[in-house]
Each structure stands twice: as structure tokens, then as C-alpha cells.
């Protein structure tokens, strides 16, 4: 079975479906946010270009003990072709800029929605 986004499915999930599910999860996070997301944890900003799924995961994986983004971390791992572990850094990180997880999620969501609308799924 393929497990993407935490859901078991009878076969590979189409990229457009996987991206839609990731977007819906990010929407869910932003809409259900009451207290500061992940206690206001800061993460490295990333360049929203090719390879950004791995870069996003590399940033978010360094946030521990935040259940609100665990599903997002799992879903992002489905878009990243290599294994990502804490402390790993990509050239796509804007290494001099840290932002709150809430802002990171908002920026990522906006970009992913536009990729979905433009049919760019990989």
C-alpha cells in the first residue's frame, strides 16, 4: 500500500491529489491556529523554487514536539526523493533568515496553491 498524507490507498496517489491533500492540510493548520503555532518556533526560510519540498521538510523537521505539523512533515516526505533528517541543510535555505513556523506555513501554502492551479505537481 502507498501511504501518503497518512491515508492508505490501493495504489499510487496521483501527484495532483497528493498536492491537493498537502494544501488542505496546510489550510487546516492555518485555520485551526489559536495559540502561536509550535509555540512560535523559528525555522530557516527557503527559496520557493525547484527542490523546495525537500528544503521545506529540512526546515520543518528541526521543529520537535509540535503535533500540529507532524502530518505536514510526513506528507512533505512523500514529495522528497531522499531521506531527510534533523540538522540537514539544503542550498535552498535562506540561511540568514529565520521566520516563525506560522509564517513559513502561510508562505508555503500560498506557493503550493499556485503550483496546483498551474498544474505543476512535481
Amino acid at each position: 500500500l502507498t501511504c501518503l498524507g497518512g491515508f492508505a490507498s490501493p495504489g499510487p496517489v496521483p501527484p495532483s491529489t497528493a498536492l491537493r491533500e498537502l494544501i488542505e492540510e496546510l489550510v487546516n493548520i492555518t485555520q485551526n491556529q489559536k495559540a502561536p503555532l509550535c509555540n512560535g518556533s523559528m525555522v530557516w526560510s527557503i527559496n520557493l523554487t525547484a527542490g523546495m519540498y525537500c528544503a521545506a521538510l529540512e526546515s520543518l523537521i528541526n521543529v520537535s514536539g509540535c503535533s500540529a505539523i507532524e502530518k505536514t512533515q510526513r506528507m512533505l516526505s512523500g514529495f522528497c526523493p531522499h531521506k531527510v533528517s534533523a540538522g540537514q541543510f539544503s542550498s535552498l535555505h535562506v540561511r540568514d533568515t529565520k521566520i516563525e513556523v506560522a509564517q513559513f506555513v502561510k508562505d508555503l501554502l500560498l506557493h503550493l496553491k499556485k503550483l496546483f492551479r498551474e498544474g505543476q505537481f512535481n
Epitope: 495532483s16 498536492l19 491537493r20 500560498l110 506557493h111 496553491k113 492551479r117 498544474g119 505537481f121
Partner: antibody, heavy 120, light 112 residues
Framework: EVQLVESGGGLVQPGGSLRLSCAAS????????IHWVRQAPGKGLEWIGR????????KYDPKFQGRFTISADNAKNSLYLQMNSLRAEDTAVYYC?????????????WGQGTLVTVSS | DIQMTQSPSSLSASVGDRVTITCRSS???????????LEWYQQKPGKAPKLLIY???NRFSGVPSRFSGSGSGTDFTLTISSLQPEDFATYYC?????????FGGGTKVEIK
């Protein structure tokens, strides 16, 4: 309140240039796409092109590519349509419109339009 | 480019009539994300267009239930179940699936 207000229309001679503006308020233009649409007198609607102000990704109908240029100024929350080598057939009301902000499925807000008349 | 062909180009009808406008695309307008970005806009003289229907059959907020959309693939329909005086206007279909996006030629609904 979301608003789009076009300006810059007027009378221009054939071969001349004009720059239209679209001032947006009530939302951040970087959060959506902005489109330019025109309508010649008594005719139908024509899509000119659109811009993603977040990254300046611009798409045109090929018939306008080269003569028309879409741009954005995020600091001013404004959009522009630069029109060069104007012809009589470019006479039209020019509208800017935004894609709705959730999934960009449709145009939910339009400006009132600005009339461009190309005539000698 | 995808051509959107509307028919009829104009029609005369009375208040209370059921009105059907069709729109045919020159090729499929199913987007690669699975959505069909087919919209219907209403325009009155001197005014900007207003959205009625999006993604083939979804009524925009505030649009009366007498307006409905249907279709798939390349053939689409806007139906006004019972024409009201404020419905006399020009209607345009629009495809936002493939760039360049394109409008239909319009259908003018006039009073009989």
C-alpha cells in the same frame, strides 16, 4: 473591502503608447493572480493576460505578446498594463480582475474599467 | 488556442421562460489538476461582468438558484429556470484551464 480601480485610459493616436494602472485595496496582490481583460465597443470579452505578483510569472494571449506588457508594484499594491504600437482595433474598455484567493478558481472582483480610444 | 463557441448569439424571451445557453470548447478543458475551469459571467451595459457559475456547476455566493450550470468535456450549458426582469443581459462562458484563457462570444438575452 476588496476593490480594483483602473485608471490611465484616454485618447491616443495610432502608433502611440499608454500605460494603464489598476490600484488594488482590501487584499494583498501577492496572494492571488491579477488578470487584464478588454472589451471593444459592442463586442465580447477578451482575456489579455495575467500576472502572479508574488514572483512576476506572467502569461499572455499570444496575440498581445510583444505589444502589451503586464507588471506589478507590490509596494504600491498596484498592477499595470503597458500598451505600445496601439491600433484602432485596440479601442476598448480595459478591466483588471482578480482570481479568488482560495483555489484561484474564478474572477471574483473586477474593476470598473477604463476606456482607451485609439484614433487620429 | 481553445475556441469557446456560444449559441445562440442572441435570444428573445419573456419573464418566466426557461432559457438555455450552450458553450462548446474546441478541445477538452479539463485541467491537469482534474478540475474543469468553466465559468459563466453576466454583464449588463456599461458594467463589469459578474460571476454566476464556476467549475461548470457551482453557483457563486449570492447568485439566485434559478441559475444553474452543467456539462463536461467540451459541452456546457447555462440554464435560467425562470427568467426574471433583472436577467436581461449578456452572458459569457469562459475557460480558465488552458492558457491563453478564452471567453465565448456572448449570448444577449433580450425581452420578447
Amino acid at each position: 473591502e476588496v476593490q480594483l480601480v483602473e485608471s490611465g485610459g484616454g485618447l491616443v493616436q495610432p502608433g502611440g503608447s499608454l500605460r494603464l494602472s489598476c490600484a488594488a485595496s482590501g487584499f494583498n496582490i501577492k496572494d492571488t493572480y491579477i488578470h487584464w481583460v478588454r472589451q471593444a465597443p459592442g463586442k465580447g470579452l477578451e482575456w489579455i493576460g495575467r500576472i502572479d505578483p508574488a514572483n512576476d510569472n506572467i502569461k499572455y494571449d499570444p496575440k498581445f505578446q510583444g505589444r502589451f506588457t503586464i507588471s506589478a508594484d507590490n509596494a504600491k499594491n498596484s498592477l499595470y498594463l503597458q500598451m505600445n504600437s496601439l491600433r484602432a482595433e485596440d479601442t476598448a474598455v480595459y478591466y483588471c480582475a482578480r482570481s479568488e484567493e482560495n483555489w484561484y478558481d474564478f474572477f471574483d472582483y473586477w474593476g470598473q474599467g477604463t476606456l482607451v480610444t485609439v484614433s487620429s | 488556442d481553445i475556441q469557446m463557441t456560444q449559441s445562440p448569439s442572441s435570444l428573445s424571451a419573456s419573464v418566466g421562460d426557461r432559457v438555455t445557453i450552450t458553450c462548446r470548447s474546441s478541445q477538452s478543458i479539463v485541467h491537469s489538476n482534474g478540475n474543469t475551469y468553466l465559468e459563466w459571467y453576466q454583464q449588463k451595459p456599461g458594467k463589469a461582468p459578474k460571476l454566476l457559475i464556476y467549475k461548470v456547476s457551482n453557483r457563486f455566493s449570492g447568485v439566485p438558484s434559478r441559475f444553474s450550470g452543467s456539462g463536461s468535456g467540451t459541452d456546457f450549458t447555462l440554464t435560467i429556470s425562470s427568467l426574471q426582469p433583472e436577467d436581461f443581459a449578456t452572458y459569457y462562458c469562459f475557460q480558465g484551464s488552458h492558457i491563453p484563457y478564452t471567453f465565448g462570444g456572448g449570448t444577449k438575452v433580450e425581452i420578447k
